[in-house]
Interface confidence: low
Amino acid sequence: QPSVSPGEPSPPSIHPGKSDLIVRVGDEIRLLCTDPGFVKWTFEILDETNENKQNEWITEKAEATNTGKYTCTNKHGLSNSIYVFVRDPAKLFLVDRSLYGKEDNDTLVRCPLTDPEVTNYSLKGCQGKPLPKDLRFIPDPKAGIMIKSVKRAYHRLCLHCSVDQEGKSVLSEKFILKVRPAFKAVPVVSVSKASYLLREGEEFTVTCTIKDVSSSVYSTWKRENSQTKLQEKYNSWHHGDFNYERQATLTISSARVNDSGVFMCYANNTFGSANVTTTLEVVDKGFINIFPMINTTVFVNDGENVDLIVEYEAFPKPEHQQWIYMNRTFTDKWEDYPKSENESNIRYVSELHLTRLKGTEGGTYTFLVSNSDVNAAIAFNVYVNTKPEILTYDRLVNGMLQCVAAGFPEPTIDWYFCPGTEQRCSASVLPVDVQTLNSSGPPFGKLVVQSSIDSSAFKHNGTVECKAYNDVGKTSAYFNFAFKGNNKEQIHPHT
């Protein structure tokens, strides 16, 4: 014992002066604590603690349960202890069957011995089953058996403390180890939908699913840039021992425009945190926005196909869609479909398929769509490009030669003179008069052009060519001249 200088308080002394004492069941335990400032005896074993204010602790008939640590404390808080074993062949173990282990930590199987002289103090599996190969333990007769570094796989492991007594193995009552898992990853969080679009007054409800190894994971819904506590409801399940799931449902019963924003589901455990967000947009009323996927002014060649395509956003869902031409509604040749199968999709596509367009089918094609709140429309102006057609080619009474041609875009008419029997008419003749006849008519039909030249300018036999052309193609008509003397005997028009 360390020497104590005079005046300095010293710990109490205990009789008998030994650290351990072994008595037989039924014998007397007599412990004397000597100290001028005696305060109390304290007895501890397992979960039990008892106190005695007498300086002599006497137990007349010792029982196995009197095994434990007896501590004498003085008024200076200094203490001394003796450990008493009450040897009872019928009760070799004192047990506290409460057995929890935290993963990766040590845990104590509390089965202290009443007889320190038994041998082979160890752990055994229940019903003769072997213990896990990697289970390591350290026995301590006064405390129990320490399992080192508890594994998750030991959860619900059934075991006994065991000793050998007179050559036989004696088992304690059974213990069942309950392992509390350590967090080795952040929680897994997911949200029912990444975005919500609602009208004022509608209910907003979103569910966050949190998965982790135990229910001690923390979770909450937060509004970004706000400290307001949100009202949420929970459901939770244990799918097996280390597979916990919680559903946290956030509800705003009547959403307002200023409820719009980003909501975060946040979860954390001792390993770290995770979050997932959902976006809420609340509008005062529904809307439809149409986006043409091609130019709204369309030029197409005669006989070719064209697809008029629009994308549109509609909220709430579109209820009526139609394509109209010349006050007539298409019953076929068009299709309307959602841009994605996503539940929160608000974008749709509508396509009108125009096939082998004729020159007479130019005009305004209109797409109309409506939902419960609004209507919207978009118009396409379709122009059909046609090769010029010469409608008439005549010699007028006044001696003029006149050519009338129709087509789109507006045809240009050129005149050529071919002397004699020449096949190639190359000398161009300037027209006297050119008129676009239907410029005030409907804007999408063929354009009609009339051009005239004075036939008196021709003094020789030959052919006059009227050539009408545009971007699509060309067409010609011919006038033949034959002179007899000074008179033009014949003018034969032909194409």
Epitope: D47, D96, R97, S98, N105, R110, K178, R180, S215, S236
Partner: antibody
Framework: QVQLVQSGAAVKKPGESLKISCKGS????????IGWVRQMPGKGLEWMGI????????RYSPSFQGQVTISAGKSISTAYLQWSSLKASDTAMYYC????????????????WGQGTMVTVSS | AIQLTQSPSSLSASVGDRVTITCRAS??????LAWYQQKPGKAPKLLIY???SLESGVPSRFSGSGSGTDFTLTISSLQPEDFATYYC?????????FGGGTKVEIK
């Protein structure tokens, strides 16, 4: 003998904070879970959460998560239940209780109960 | 969360009567069920744990039975001190939950 002794009744205003206590004696405090149970006036029992004082591992009921904090001082064998901002709806009797032994591999029933702490929140 | 439904919610009985209270779980909870007695102004008291084990110091007229989803608390011969409210509680999985209670009154 084994017992849990709770702190006295508390009267508070909405928005105030509060911490109530539960002191264990007569057993090894660090080796048993301590739970908290709420009983609103005229109503049934509601489990709030538990703590293992040995390492302060806590489990909360989802209904109370984020509303209260459970803690423990193992050196003084005391568990705590606290609120940072009380509401009128927090008015209730609060009991602490010890998880006894369940021999079937589960955490056990509440075998020892405190006497209860009445919390009244009123403006 | 596991829901516990107690029935009846209240009953009237006389001293000496045999009283049975049932507790039904929304999913299987093995035998992880306890029964408590609570008198007005007092803390609850544990009667039965692990569905059928009698807590130390509780009179033998109290018994529990059942496993899985259906459980019963029986008082074989009702005594004057037994008039109280009785609660079941599951401790199979978190969150731990209580039944709504059964009030036993004097007829």
């Amino acid at each position: 003998q084994v017992q849990l002794v709770q702190s006295g009744a508390a009267v508070k205003k909405p928005g105030e904070s509060l911490k109530i206590s539960c002191k264990g004696s007569g057993y090894r405090f660090t080796s048993y879970w301590i739970g908290w149970v709420r009983q609103m006036p005229g109503k049934g029992l509601e489990w709030m959460g538990i703590i293992y004082p040995g390492d302060s591992d806590t489990r909360y009921s989802p209904s109370f998560q984020g509303q209260v904090t459970i803690s423990a001082g193992k050196s003084i064998s005391t568990a705590y239940l606290q609120w940072s901002s009380l509401k009128a709806s927090d008015t209730a009797m609060y009991y602490c209780a010890r998880h006894g032994r369940g021999y079937n591999g589960y955490d056990g029933a509440f075998d020892i109960w405190g006497q209860g702490t009445m919390v009244t929140v009123s403006s | 969360a596991i829901q516990l439904t107690q029935s009846p919610s209240s009953l009237s009985a006389s001293v000496g009567d045999r009283v049975t209270i049932t507790c039904r779980a929304s999913q299987g909870i093995s035998s992880a069920l306890a029964w408590y007695q609570q008198k007005p102004g007092k803390a609850p008291k544990l009667l039965i744990y692990d569905a059928s084990s009698l807590e130390s110091g509780v009179p033998s007229r109290f018994s529990g039975s059942g496993s899985g989803t259906d459980f019963t608390l029986t008082i074989s011969s009702l005594q004057p001190e037994d008039f109280a409210t009785y609660y079941c509680q599951q401790f199979n999985s978190y969150p731990l939950t209580f039944g709504g209670g059964t009030k036993v009154e004097i007829k």
